[in-house]
Structure formats: C-alpha cells, structure tokens
C-alpha cells in the first residue's frame, strides 16, 4: 500500500520506497553479510523502510540490491532519485584500503516482471555515486543525519519495464529513500485550447510537438500548439481558439452569456448587453429578441438598437395653384430611433359626392423631385384634373417599416384643383335634319374642368366658308337649329364654358338640309 | 436556499472543509462563490466554481483555499488555517443574469486559534 | 483584480432625509455596468438592492436608486427609514475576478 507524497505536478512517480508500508523485500546478492533492510524513523519519527552496507573492513566487497521491477508506463526516459547517508572513511580507524566512498547505479529494462536473480552482466551501469557530504561519529552523537540526494536519469526505454541495481564495493551506506519518477507536461488549458499529459521526449533536449484541442463552445483560429519540454514545461504556444458565439472567456473556459446578454461572432470578445428595446430569455444568445413593436432591419447589425416605424408628419401644408399643388410638412416627432427616414405620397382622387369612394390618381400625375424615397419635406404634384377632389396622404417610413403589421405613419389633406376651361366635346350628334331645321345632341368633355355654365353652337353655311357664321347658346347637351335653308351644306361646331372660359370647338360636324323630313345620328363627322 | 455547515473552533495549520447545501436549484445551472468577512470587516471574495466544475480564486486566495462540489453541495476547504482566516463564510449564488450574487446562505462562523 | 474604493466609510442622516454613497472602481468594470449593491445588517447575509449598476432587485423600494457607468457608480437612499440603517457594499467584476468595496456604514438618526 502507498501512502500519498506530493510531488511537483510534472512528475510521475513510478517508485517511491518511503511510500511502501510494511517490508520493501528487494533482492540483495549475496543474501546475507550484504545489503540488509533496516527501518529506521525519519526526522517526523514516522518509520521508514531503508537498506544499509558497512562492511568496510573486508576488501572485494560486491553487494548488489536489485529493486522490484518498474514499470515503463510509456516513459522514455525515467530519472532516479536517491537520497542517502554515508560515512567518512576518515573517521573509520584501520580501513584504510578497504573502505569506499561511493557506490555504483545499474539498470537493466526487462519485459519480465518476475526475475528472481540478480545476474551482473544483464545490468548496465548508470553512474558511480559519490556523496557530497559524508558523516563522522560526531554526528551519530549529535544524531545527526547528514541526507545526501542524487538524480540521475537513463533513457530511452524501449521494454515494458525496468529493474534498479545499487553495487555496493565497500562503503558504508543507508539507502534511505528510492524515488524513479519521469516527467510530463501536466494537462494544461491555453488559449482556449486544451492540452494533454505529455510524457517528456527520449533525450533531455527534446521537445514533444502536442496539437490542442479546443475546449468546450471554442472553436480554432489558428491550430493550437504547444510543445512539451525535457523538464515537463510546456513552451511556445501556437494558435488559439475563440469562443463561439453565444460565448464568452472566463477562466479558461467557454461559457454561456448570461440571459439579457449576446454574443453574435466567434471572437475573443466578451458578451454584451442586449442592446435598448431588446432582450434575451436564455443564456447563450447570438443575437437578442426586438422588444413588442420594435424591430430590427436586415442590414442592422446585431449591436444596433431595435428600432421602430417614425410616427406620421406633422404640419401638412397644402398650396393649389389650378391644376398643381404643393405640399410641405414637418418632420415626424418620433423618427423611431432611426436616420433613414424618408417619404412617400400617395394621391388619390375622390369623387365629389362621396369622397370616401377615392381612386388612385394614375400614371398621368408628376411629382417633383419624385413621389417615393423623398428626402425634403416638400413635394410638387401636378398634371393634376381641374375642379377634382384630391386626396393626397405623406408616409413617413423608415428601415424597419415594412415589418409594423398596424401602420399609423401617414398624414392626409383632401383639396379641391381650380376650375379651368374645359376640354372639347368630343361627340357632336345630328339627331334628326328636316328641310329648316337640324336637332344636335352631344356629351360632356371628358374634362369638364368645372361646372359646364353653357354651351355655345356655331354654324354656317359650307360654302360661306366660316366668312359668315351664326352662334347658339343653351344649357343643355342639345339644341334644334331653325331658320336653315333647304338642301343646303352647314357646318356645326360645339364648345362648352365654366367660368374659367370656354374649352375648344369640337371637331366639325356637316349636315345637308333635306326636302324630305329624315332622322338620322352625326358622329361628328360629315352627314348627309 | 443555501446552508453553511462545519465552522467551528480550530487550530492553526488543521485543514478545515466547510460545506454549502444547496436546495430548489440545480448546481449543473450557476455558479457559486465563497465570500467570507473577518469579524467587524467587509466582505472578501474568496473564489468560485463554475458550473463545469472548473474553478478560479482571487489571487490572494490562490493556494489558500480549494472549492469543490458534489451534485446538492459545495465545499470550500481551507487548507491551513491561520488566525487570519478567522471569518464568518457565506456561500453564494452567482446570478444567471448579471455578474453578482443572488442567493446567500446565514453563514458559517469559522475560529481559528491555538 | 479591479479595486473598489468606496465613500464615505460612515454617512448620519434623519429619517426621511437622503444619504448618496460613492463606489470608484480602478478600471472600468465588466460591460462598463457590472456593479451590484448589498445591504448587510448586523449577523445577516448581505441582501442584493441594485444590479447591472441601476436595475432595482425584486422587492427592493423605488427609494435605492443605483446609477453610473464605467468607474464611478452611485447608491442613493432617499426618504430615509429607520430599516435603512446597516452597512453597504458595492461589488464590481471584471475579468474573471469580483471585489467588494470596503462598506459604507448608514446611521439613521
């Protein structure tokens, strides 16, 4: 049973003889008169397990202590470490030329744990060694124990295992503790990259090249890799890894941003707030959830605030000049937190009876500088219809309008265009012709333009070539023309007025007086 | 809830471990915190355990102090106690919303004297 | 680790009056708002009034009022009570390390 010794976190302890309780039992040659296992107490008093020679007297002394057998476990180059007391033959009468002052360390690697001899050729010699300082018999008085400690180290190893060898050649000798440990790179973390036990290469200037892994919620930047040292020190970090998103460095290690926190990158930032008018409900976000009525734009970027829709204008002025109109308004009072507002108009004409019964305005309306994406808070619209209902309403939108589901963003003014003259009839009809008379009917312009107050009917004969012509007023869209004389050509032009003037003549309409009474329709053309 | 047990009178230089007892949440979601006041002082934060089970010490604390847990409990072992280390012991819930404590235990009153 | 250096050791106040307590930290702390406030009465656990440096902890009266950024935070107990009376402690945190502030004593007079 082993009892537990600390020892540097770099070292892997394969032996340890002051940790074996009860009796070592190594093999000594020859059995007896040799090395002798004696227990002894430490400067704790706790016992311990020791193994002494002092046969000094005789000469040819050659006593081997062979250890158990050691295993390798993938160690390929182990160190030795001996701590032990030795006399100073000086201090020892009438040894002259028999008594030594050091001893001899073998080794011998063997796939077989269970060599019962000692056999002196098999071993190979690791060193001779000699004590740095040696006790005289004052200091057994004194109770001194002057403890001398050596490291040596043999490699590489190929087999599974090894045994130790002390050759004692006539010194006098307490082995007080055997320690064969080798040494790795202890498991490690660096740069968010996690690093294994390395065990120490071959030869004392080796370095072991170790590839680390990422830790947890990491992934590589560059490959992470360290290289693991002769004395178990790592050395020359490469590469790193970063927290994924979501993540964060702490100690070490990768962890989940808190709730109300994001990370949207693999970097090597930390997390941040959520940013205002957004949150996040579980730990580990990538990017935080746009409060109610907040949102965020698809080239937003994560760290941007949630915005919203700006509320409508304010201030809607409207400016008629006959078929034009100018509008101006103020800025919203709320842009929604963001800078890319702008503006739309939206015309619409309404009929005068109903104005809730409104239809687009269509292509034939112009606006300057343009109708959507407006910058300035102005806008002039025209090729407008004199004398319509007009509705025109200003959106304001910015980045994220298209996602508010219950828009409220616009401000409206309804106006009426001016009056103008109106357009030319465009049907002039010759309902019934007799030998005196011609009955007209026609239809409205297509632009009245106004109120139509009346209209004026001009005719004359063909031949008199407008050189003579005589006029008609009526309020209605038909009139009977008397007084004409038979079998004659004329010539009838309609025009209506609003009280901004008369429109244009409509296009000439011929008819021939008959002798026989006849109803026949014009169609603005010529008739006979 | 949190509830500190095992301080008591000791010697300096014996190892004492003081434990944390957790109850109505789980110690796989928050870390925890040892925080300790002298008598008549302020509060010192002594280290934490993370949910992984990795830990991390003021540096102060380093060598000093070893935190440990097992699925309902958290330790913190002082490993040579001076008279210095003579305190009232809170253990401490880091919060999974901001970076501070929620949650602390009564305390445990630790003497350390010969 | 970042050092907290708070002020004053000691405010007196009446009831019903304000005392303001100042916390200074030697760096900006974590997200330039990571700083919490404690109230500690005599043999109690510390009692956590304001986190994220002004956001109030549930059940703690609209009277603590936290605010600041970066390295200099303030604790502002208005309408003084008589219960108000104990010790303060800020906290900040910044990379990987917390600290508390050395306390702030409140007496309500």
């Known amino acids: 049973v082993t009892g537990s010794r600390v020892y540097p976190a770099n070292e892997v302890t394969l032996l340890d003889s002051r940790s074996v309780q009860g009796e070592l039992g190594w093999i000594a040659s020859p059995l007896e008169g040799g090395w002798e296992e004696v227990s002894i107490m430490d400067e704790k008093n706790t016992p311990i397990r020791t193994y002494q020679v002092c046969n000094v007297m005789e000469p040819s002394q050659n006593n081997w202590l062979r250890t158990d057998w050691i295993t390798r476990e993938g160690a390929q180059r182990v160190y030795i470490e001996i701590k032990f007391t030795l006399r100073d033959c000086n201090s020892l009468p009438g040894v002259m030329g028999t008594c030594k002052e050091t001893f001899n360390l073998y080794y011998y690697e063997s796939d077989n744990d269970k060599e019962r001899f000692i056999r002196e050729n098999q071993f190979v010699k690791i060193d001779t060694i000699a004590a740095d300082e040696s006790f005289t018999q004052v200091d057994i008085g004194d109770r001194i124990m002057k403890l001398n400690t050596e490291i040596r180290d043999v490699g590489p190893l190929s087999k599974k295992g090894f045994y130790l060898a002390f050759q004692d050649v006539g010194a006098c000798i307490a082995l007080v503790s055997v320690r064969v440990f080798y040494k790795k790179c202890p498991l490690t973390v660096r740069n968010l990259a996690q690093f294994p036990d390395t065990i120490t290469g071959a030869d004392t200037s080796s370095l072991v090249e170790v590839r680390g892994s990422c830790v947890n919620n990491s992934e590589e930047k560059d490959v992470p890799k360290m290289y693991c040292g002769a004395d178990g020190e790592w050395l020359v970090p490469i590469g790193n890894c970063l927290c994924n998103a979501g993540h964060e460095e702490r100690s070490g290690e990768c962890q989940a941003c808190k709730i109300g926190y994001y990370k949207a990158l693999s970097t090597d930032a930390t997390c941040a707030k959520c940013p205002p008018h957004s949150y996040s409900v579980w730990e580990g976000a990538t990017s935080c959830t746009c409060d109610r009525g907040f949102f965020r734009a698809d080239n937003d970027a994560a760290s941007m605030p949630c915005t919203r829709p700006p509320s409508a204008p304010l201030n809607l002025i409207s400016n008629v000049n006959e078929t034009s109109v100018n509008l101006e308004w103020s800025s919203p009072q709320n842009t929604g937190g963001r800078q890319d507002i702008s503006y739309n108009v939206v015309c619409k004409k309404c009929g005068a009876g109903d104005p809730s019964k409104c239809r687009p305005c269509g292509s034939g309306v112009h606006y300057t500088p343009q109708q959507n994406g407006l910058k300035t808070t102005k806008v002039s619209i025209t090729d407008l219809l004199a004398h319509t209902n007009y509705t025109f309403e200003i959106w304001a939108v910015n980045g994220v309008s298209k996602y508010n589901p219950n828009p409220d963003q616009s401000v409206s003014v309804t106006v009426t265009t001016n009056q103008a003259a109106p357009s030319s009839i465009a049907l002039v009809q010759a309902k019934e012709v007799t030998r005196y008379s011609v009955a007209l009917a026609w239809l409205e312009p297509d632009r009245p333009n106004g109120v139509i107050l009346e209209y004026e009917v001009k005719y004359y004969e063909k031949d008199q070539n407008e050189r003579s012509y005589r006029i008609v007023r009526t309020a209605a869209r038909n009139t009977d023309i008397k007084g004409l004389n038979p079998l004659t050509s004329y010539v009838f032009h309609v025009r209506a007025r609003t009280a901004a003037g008369y429109g244009d003549f409509s296009e000439p309409l011929e008819v021939t007086t008959n002798t026989v009474p006849s109803r026949i329709i014009g169609d603005g053309a010529n008739s006979t | 809830s949190l509830e500190e047990s095992g301080g008591r009178l000791v010697t300096p230089g014996t190892p004492l471990t003081l434990t944390c007892t957790v109850s109505g949440f789980s110690l796989s979601s928050y870390h925890m915190s040892w925080v300790r006041q002298a008598p008549g002082k302020g509060l010192e934060w002594i280290g934490i355990?993370?949910?992984?089970?990795n830990t991390y010490y003021a540096n102060w604390a380093k060598g000093r102090f070893t935190i440990s847990k097992t699925s309902t409990t958290v330790d913190l072992k002082i490993t040579s106690p001076t008279t210095e280390d003579t305190a009232t012991y809170f253990c401490?819930?880091?919060?999974?919303?901001?970076?501070?404590?929620?949650?602390w235990g009564p305390g445990t009153l630790v003497t350390v004297s010969s | 680790a970042i050092k907290m250096t708070q002020t004053p050791s000691s405010v007196s106040a009446a009831v019903g009056g304000t005392v303001t307590i100042n916390c200074q930290a030697s760096?900006?702390?974590?997200?330039?708002?990571?700083l919490a406030w404690y109230q500690q009465k005599p043999g109690q656990p510390p009692k956590l009034l304001i986190y994220?440096?002004?956001s109030l902890a549930s059940g703690v009266p609209s009277r603590f009022k936290g605010s600041g950024s970066g390295t200099e935070f303030t604790l502002t107990i208005s309408d003084l009570e008589c219960a108000d009376a104990a010790t303060y402690y800020c906290?900040?945190?910044?990379?990987?390390?917390?600290?508390f502030g050395g306390g702030t004593e409140v007496v309500v007079k």
């Open positions: 760096q900006s702390v974590y997200g330039n708002n990571e």
């Open positions: 355990i993370y949910r992984s089970g």
């Open positions: 401490a819930r880091e919060s999974s919303t901001f970076y501070g404590m929620d949650l």
């Open positions: 994220t440096a002004s």
């Open positions: 906290l900040g945190y910044k990379s990987d390390d917390y600290t």
